[in-house]
Each structure stands twice: as C-alpha cells, then as structure tokens.
C-alpha cells in the first residue's frame, strides 16, 4: 500500500509555532482543559487511519481555528498566517492523495476528530481558538511521530 | 520579485463609493498582510486598514470603520479597497502595500491610486 | 491607539552631513515593531529599516535605526542628493498600524 507524501517543512510550521507559542498560551483563560492535549485518541490512531485523520485537524485549524481567533497583535496574526498557509499546503496534498483513495476515512479516524469538535464546542468561541492554538504543538508533534507513515512511499 | 498594480485614477461625486484594486504578483499571495494606506495632498501617511487573504477579515483603523472595505480574492492574487460615502476630504492617493514578513513592515508598494471627490 | 511623534518637522541640512531623525512612541513598543519608510515626492514610500533597526534589502548601510521602547532614531551617516525627502517611522504593535507625521529632510 502506497503511503500518502506530505512535502513539507515542518521545521518551519514549529519554528513559527514556537515564536509565537508563549504569547498564545498567555491568553489561555482555561489552563486545566484541553482541546487536543490529553487526547489518548490521537495517540492510538492506526498508520490506516492517519492520513484521514491529519486532513480532518488540518480542516479543523483552517477552517474552524484560524477564522475565529482574533489576534490584535499584527506580527502574531502573520505568524499565524504563515502556519496556516502550510496547512493549506498540506490540505492540496492530501486532496490528491484522496483522489487516489489513499486516505480513506474509517469510524474511527472520525470518532477521533468528532471528539475534538465537541470539546471545542464546550467553550466560548474565542477561549476555544486560543486554545486549539496553544496546543498546535500536540497536532504538530503527532505529525512528527507518525513522519514515516505519512512521507514514505 | 514582488509587484502591485493599482488601477487608474477615479473621480467621484461627493456621496458615492470607489472601489479600488490591486492586483499582486511574483510571490505568495494568501498568507501575506495587504495594506491599504492613504495619503492627502500635502498631508503625511494614514493607515486605513489590512487583510490577511487566508483569513478573509479585516482590520480597520477607527477612523474608516463603516465606511471601507477590505477583500481581498484569492484566485485571482486581488485586494480591494471600498470607501463609500465620499466626501472633499477623502480626496488623496490610495495605496495598497504588502508585508515582506511581518504585518506592518510594509515591504512592497503599489503606484498608488489617485482619487478625486468633487461635485 | 498608540501615537507617533516625529521631531523635527524639517531639517535642513548640506550634502555629506550626517542627520539625526526622532520618532517617539506615545506607550512603549518592542523593536521589532518599528520601521522607517522614505517618501519622494510623487512616489510611493520606501521600507528602509524594519524591526527598528535591520536594513531592508538594497538599502545602503549609511542608513541605520536604533532604540527601543518609546525612542526610536533613524540616522543618515553621510548625506547623499538623493537622500533628501521625507521619513516616516510606522508602529506595527497593534491595530491600528499608526504613523509618524513625518520629518522633511532638505537640503540648506
């Protein structure tokens, strides 16, 4: 089974990430909840089902994350804009992989992400924004571990 | 290399709207702060607002809040500035500026856009 | 909002001087959040310093900006005919982004 190719630089996405990550966690007004962080769903997600699953959180910050958030801080909203420009990157790359019904999505790789909607659900829009960003690191660190799976052929 | 092509210069009646564009090339164009700054004759340089494509809101300057527009489409790498009514004093030339890596170190300049309100 | 105060208004100065310009904040912004633009007239304004004291690219290095918190200063070493035009220093903190009034450096 060939494996879906994801092009790139991760290093970047995190360099951004750590720039702004003390500045993001700040403003947390909910420090003992979690959106991703705890999530033992993530980490017992199957290599069939990472590629359905890493589309879904890419979805979930460009859609949902990145569009409510409100930044005043003009450099921090770049910051952001970058990381979220590799998202978008990413997502044209698992498009194609879908296309080639690569990344096909299984009741658990849905359940996964359901569960992250609906603890974003349980706060006040922009905590949950703060939030999820603030844990971009967890999203980003899941991504490393499951490297090989995702840009080996 | 970076360019911005504003369009031409527009003459308008106290009361209407402008709506001006300006089209980016060479470089990414979503994830990037277009500016729009305006200047007076004779006068120093005034902030009016900025977009960042990708999330498709603006931010505007107290000032200009209800009164412009900032979009910005993506397909075609365009923003667009829309004052609406016009008075005397909004005569100026319009530019439309884009970060070279931060939102505000406004690295590239459009020609700038000269608009005229006179009845 | 936070407000830039550009001093002099004018400086009048010869070629191969060396001119001193102020911007002031009116409450306290890292370095990295200043920069300074060149305007001639009839033209469209220039990046020269960003993050208060880096050179843009292509600026020559007799342009040169220091400070931080409320006091920013761009410095022209030595003044060439070209040089002379009007400078704005830019607060890019927070919304709004504000500029100076400008200075107007020309020549004595």
């Known amino acids: 089974l060939r494996r879906c190719l994801i092009s790139t630089d991760m290093h970047h996405i995190e360099e951004s990430f750590q720039e702004i990550k003390r500045a993001i966690q700040a403003k947390d007004t909910f420090p003992n909840v979690t959106i991703l962080s705890t999530l033992e769903t993530l980490q017992i997600i199957k290599p069939l089902d990472v590629c359905c699953v890493t589309k879904n959180l890419l979805a979930f910050y460009v859609d949902r994350v990145f569009k409510d958030h409100q930044e005043p801080n003009p450099k921090i909203l770049r910051k952001i804009s970058s990381i979220a420009n590799s998202f978008l990157y990413m997502q044209k790359t698992l498009r194609q992989c879908q296309e080639q019904r690569q990344c096909h999505c299984r009741q658990e790789a849905t359940n996964a992400t359901r569960v992250i909607h609906d603890n974003y659900d349980q706060l006040e829009v922009h905590a949950a924004a703060i939030k999820s960003l603030g844990e971009l690191d967890v999203f980003l660190a899941w991504i490393n571990k499951n490297h090989e799976v995702m840009f080996s052929a | 290399q970076v360019q911005l092509v504003q369009s031409g210069a527009e003459v308008k009646k106290p009361g209407s709207s402008v709506k001006v564009s300006c089209k980016a090339s060479?470089?990414?164009?979503?994830?990037?702060?277009i500016s729009w700054v305006r200047q007076a004759p004779g006068q120093g340089l005034e902030w009016m607002g900025g977009i960042i494509p990708i999330f498709g809101t603006a931010n505007y300057a107290q000032k200009f809040q209800g009164r412009v527009t900032i979009t910005a489409d993506e397909s075609t790498s365009t923003a667009y500035m829309e004052l609406s009514s016009l008075r005397s004093e909004d005569t100026a030339v319009y530019y439309c500026?884009?970060?070279?890596?931060?939102?505000?170190?406004?690295?590239?300049w459009g020609q700038g856009t000269l608009v005229t309100v006179s009845s | 909002e936070i407000v830039m105060t550009q001093s002099p208004g004018t400086l009048s100065l010869s070629p191969g001087e060396r001119a001193t310009l102020s911007c002031r904040a009116s409450?306290?912004?890292?370095?990295?959040?200043l920069a300074w633009y060149q305007q001639k007239p009839g033209q469209a304004p220039r990046l020269l310093i960003y993050?208060?004291?880096s050179r843009a690219t292509g600026i020559p290095d007799r342009f040169s900006g220091s400070g931080s918190g409320t006091d920013f200063t761009l410095t022209i070493s030595r003044l060439e005919p070209e040089d002379f035009a009007t400078y704005y220093c830019l607060q890019f903190k927070s919304f709004p982004l504000t500029f100076g009034q400008g200075t107007k450096l020309e020549i004595k």
């Open positions: 409450q306290s912004i890292s370095s990295g959040y």
């Open positions: 500026a884009r970060d070279g890596g931060d939102y505000g170190d406004m690295g590239y």
């Open positions: 993050g208060a004291s």
């Open positions: 060479g470089g990414t164009f979503s994830s990037y702060a």
